[in-house]
């Protein structure tokens, strides 16, 4: 058993049929010595008396809010949560496996630049009695500070018969050094509590590996005289690190016809303009990627090719 | 050229070669995200690798103030990786494919280090840790880790030279 936060405790249980469970001793936080009784949740059934209560925690029915009273007055609470371990593996029932970029990916994180600011998100089908708490640091043995905000519900989607909820959190490295080569990864830890179930999820990454620039901005077309060629121009996204002579992007320009079957023409360039051929009903799209490190491409910025 | 005396490097040449290094490093080990090498207990490799750190003056302001500190750090790293790529880790079994970009990568590391420090000038270099994995699978894993680490190193070096070519060239 360990303390998650004040008056909230996590009991780690090996979860299998007829498991013995864990013996837990609860102590009433009071200077009083006698006349103390214990109850669980809203029940008025007295579970025991005395300053301490010893219980055998085997299942979710044994978890919950234990309260010690004296003469009708509440003295203190202890909330017991369960953390299940099945076949040596901690349960991951609360969050959905996003399977990207690999299986058992519960947390996904992205950064728009090298400023040390990043966003993580996760998915669940659970809609109520759910809380998250997020902590982060740079490195684990001698951790350097990363400050995370509160996790918030950022999107709701219908997936077949189920509703899916996306939560996200923003974090900022306290003393970020955008130009340095990272040697210690960022660690992100998410505590998830659903009713009386506790789970924790972690992710470890370098900012450079989760970079995904915003799409190029101000995408414009300038037709060339007596030609179906156009000069496409764009600008670096506002959110990208500066100066651009140092934090450079490379770009992919694509001409895509109306039908997905039509062949795509693609041009790669380090410049912020390119000359391409417009086809009927085509659109021109541009996306960006760090020029020197192959992290994710941005989403496409698109304009119709007319 | 970046020499201990403090003259400027051939920024544009360095920019071109460092960008080529980035391309080669990624073609030598293109897998991103498929194999989380940090799960494989790699402290003995990466702890000894010379990283370009915050105080090394490789940021735009530091380069403007005095690019020598940064260039020396980059030079150390280039020599370090050049020696690693020429070591038994890469020359031993399992043999690299004949068309592997590692050979070109090795040559380009040497080329860039020579651009930064011509014959007759010496910056101190870092000792190469003795990494001699016994099993071919360990050697393969170590190659991946070294290449991942090299990708990060050359990315910073390429940014430095791109910025230098754009803002510090005479």
């Amino acid at each position: 058993i360990w303390e998650l936060k004040k008056d909230v405790y996590v009991v780690e249980l090996d979860w299998y049929p007829d498991a013995p469970g864990e013996m837990v001793v609860l102590t009433c936080d009071t200077p009083e010595e006698d006349g103390i009784t214990w109850t669980l949740d809203q029940s008025s059934e007295v579970l025991g008396s005395g300053k301490t209560l010893t219980i055998q925690v085997k299942e979710f029915g044994d978890a919950g809010q234990y309260t010690c009273h004296k003469g009708g007055e509440v003295l203190s609470h202890s909330l017991l949560l369960l953390h299940k371990k099945e076949d040596g593996i901690w349960s991951t029932d609360i969050l959905k496996d996003q399977k990207e970029p690999k299986n058992k990916t519960f947390l996904r994180c992205e950064a728009k630049n090298y400023s040390g600011r990043f966003t993580c998100w996760w998915l669940t089908t659970i809609s109520t009695d759910l809380t998250f708490s997020v902590k982060s640091s740079r490195g684990s043995s001698d951790p350097q500070g990363v400050t995370c905000g509160a996790a918030t519900l950022s999107a709701e989607r219908v997936r077949g018969d189920n509703k899916e909820y996306e939560y996200s959190v923003e974090c900022q490295e306290d003393s970020a050094c955008p130009a340095a080569e990272e040697s210690l990864p960022i660690e992100v830890m998410v505590d998830a509590v659903h009713k009386l179930k506790y789970e924790n999820y972690t992710s470890s990454f370098f900012i450079r590996d989760i970079i995904k620039p915003d799409p190029p901005k101000n995408l414009q077309l300038k037709p060339l005289k007596n030609s179906r060629q156009v000069e496409v121009s764009w600008e670096y996204p506002d959110t990208w690190s500066t100066p651009h002579s140092y934090f450079s992007l490379t770009f992919c320009v694509q001409v895509q016809g109306k039908s997905k079957r039509e062949k795509k023409d693609r041009v790669f360039t380090d410049k912020t303009s390119a000359t391409v051929i417009c086809r009927k009903n085509a659109s021109i799209s541009v996306r960006a990627q760090d020029r020197y490190y192959s992290s994710s491409w941005s989403e496409w910025a698109s304009v119709p090719c007319s | 050229r970046a020499v201990p005396g403090g003259s400027s490097p051939a920024w544009t040449q360095c920019q071109q070669l460092s960008q080529k290094l980035c391309t080669l490093a990624w073609s030598a080990h293109p897998l991103v995200g498929h194999m989380d090498l940090r799960e494989e207990g790699d402290e003995e490799t990466t702890n000894d690798v010379p990283h370009i750190q915050c105080g090394d003056g490789c940021d735009p302001q530091g380069l403007r103030d005095n690019s020598q500190f940064c260039l020396q750090r980059i030079h150390q790293g280039l020599i370090f990786y050049e020696k690693l790529l020429g070591s038994d880790i890469f020359t031993g079994e399992p043999s690299l494919l004949p068309d592997s970009p590692v050979g070109q990568l090795h040559a380009s590391l040497l080329g860039l280090s020579q651009l930064l420090q011509p014959e007759g000038h010496h910056w101190e270099t870092q000792q190469i840790p003795s990494l001699s994995p016994s099993q071919p699978w360990q050697r393969l894993l170590l190659r991946f880790k070294i290449l991942r680490s090299l990708q990060a190193f050359v990315a910073v070096a390429a940014r430095v030279f791109a910025h230098g070519a754009a803002t510090l060239s005479p």
Epitope: L224, N226, S227, R228, Q229, K280, N281 | -
Partner: antibody, heavy 119, light 110 residues
Framework: QSLEESGGRLVTPGTPLTLTCTVS????????MNWVRQSPGKGLEWIGA?????GTAYANWAKGRFTISKTSTTVDLQIASPTTEDTATYFC????????????????WGPGTLVTVSS | AVLTQTPSPVSATVGGTVTIKCQSS????????LSWYQQKPGQPPKLLIY???TLASGVPSRFSGSGSGTQFTLTISGVQCDDAATYYC???????????FGGGTEVVVV
């Protein structure tokens, strides 16, 4: 910039015929080329085109009857099995724009070559 | 697509104005992929107007084009004897196979 059609002659129905348009002064890798015909005393009919990248398009009535192909300096129109209805002057015309759409304006035009199909 | 030209023939007096209409059975590509041609007997057609209203190089300014979508007009203001010819419109569409010429309008100058 010039175009000249050749290959027009008198043929019997069903005898395959290939017309050739020879171009000079511009590159077929940057221009779309069209074939148009005109029956005696009648209007213009667009047959089909080959675009700068080698893609072809045909009028719905012409599909299966005509095939357009090109080399670096020539554009061919093959008439698979001519009928008397195919008697006409055949023109080749360049797309006006560099990298023109099919259906863009045609300019310049060749002088035309006459095909007569008769038994 | 079917392009219908009206009227035909049309007679004009020197110095007068001639208006030829071209109606398309479907909207041309981007509302303006329509061109006009002049053809004299024994000659290939000559481009006059492209993109519905842009005058081709070397074409006298008495020729003008207008219209959008499915309805287009070629106007000859201050007709001259040399303008006696047959005029054709050509439409381009989303589907390349729909490319087609109008039936032609013969202009007779009296």
């Amino acid at each position: 910039q010039s175009l000249e059609e050749s290959g027009g002659r008198l043929v019997t129905p069903g005898t395959p015929l290939t017309l050739t348009c020879t171009v000079s002064g511009f590159s077929l890798s940057t221009y779309t080329m069209n074939w148009v015909r005109q029956s005696p005393g009648k209007g213009l009919e667009w047959i089909g085109a080959i675009s700068y990248d080698g893609g072809t398009a045909y009028a719905n009535w012409a599909k299966g009857r005509f095939t357009i192909s090109k080399t670096s300096t020539t554009v061919d129109l093959q008439i698979a099995s001519p009928t008397t209805e195919d008697t006409a002057t055949y023109f080749c015309a360049r797309g006006f724009y560099v990298y023109a759409y099919i259906g863009d304006a045609f300019d310049p035009w060749g002088p035309g070559t006459l095909v007569t199909v008769s038994s | 697509a079917v392009l219908t030209q009206t009227p035909s023939p049309v007679s004009a007096t020197v110095g007068g104005t001639v208006t030829i209409k071209c109606q398309s059975s479907q909207t041309v590509y981007k509302n303006n992929l329509l061109s006009w041609y002049q053809q004299k007997p024994g000659q290939p057609p000559k481009l006059l107007i492209y993109l519905a209203s842009t005058l081709a190089s070397g074409v006298p300014s008495r020729f003008s084009g207008s219209g959008s979508g499915t309805q287009f007009t070629l106007t000859i203001s201050g007709v001259q004897c040399d303008d006696a010819a047959t005029y054709y419109c050509l439409g381009g569409y989303d589907d390349d196979a729909d490319t087609a010429f109008g039936g032609g309008t013969e202009v007779v100058v009296v």
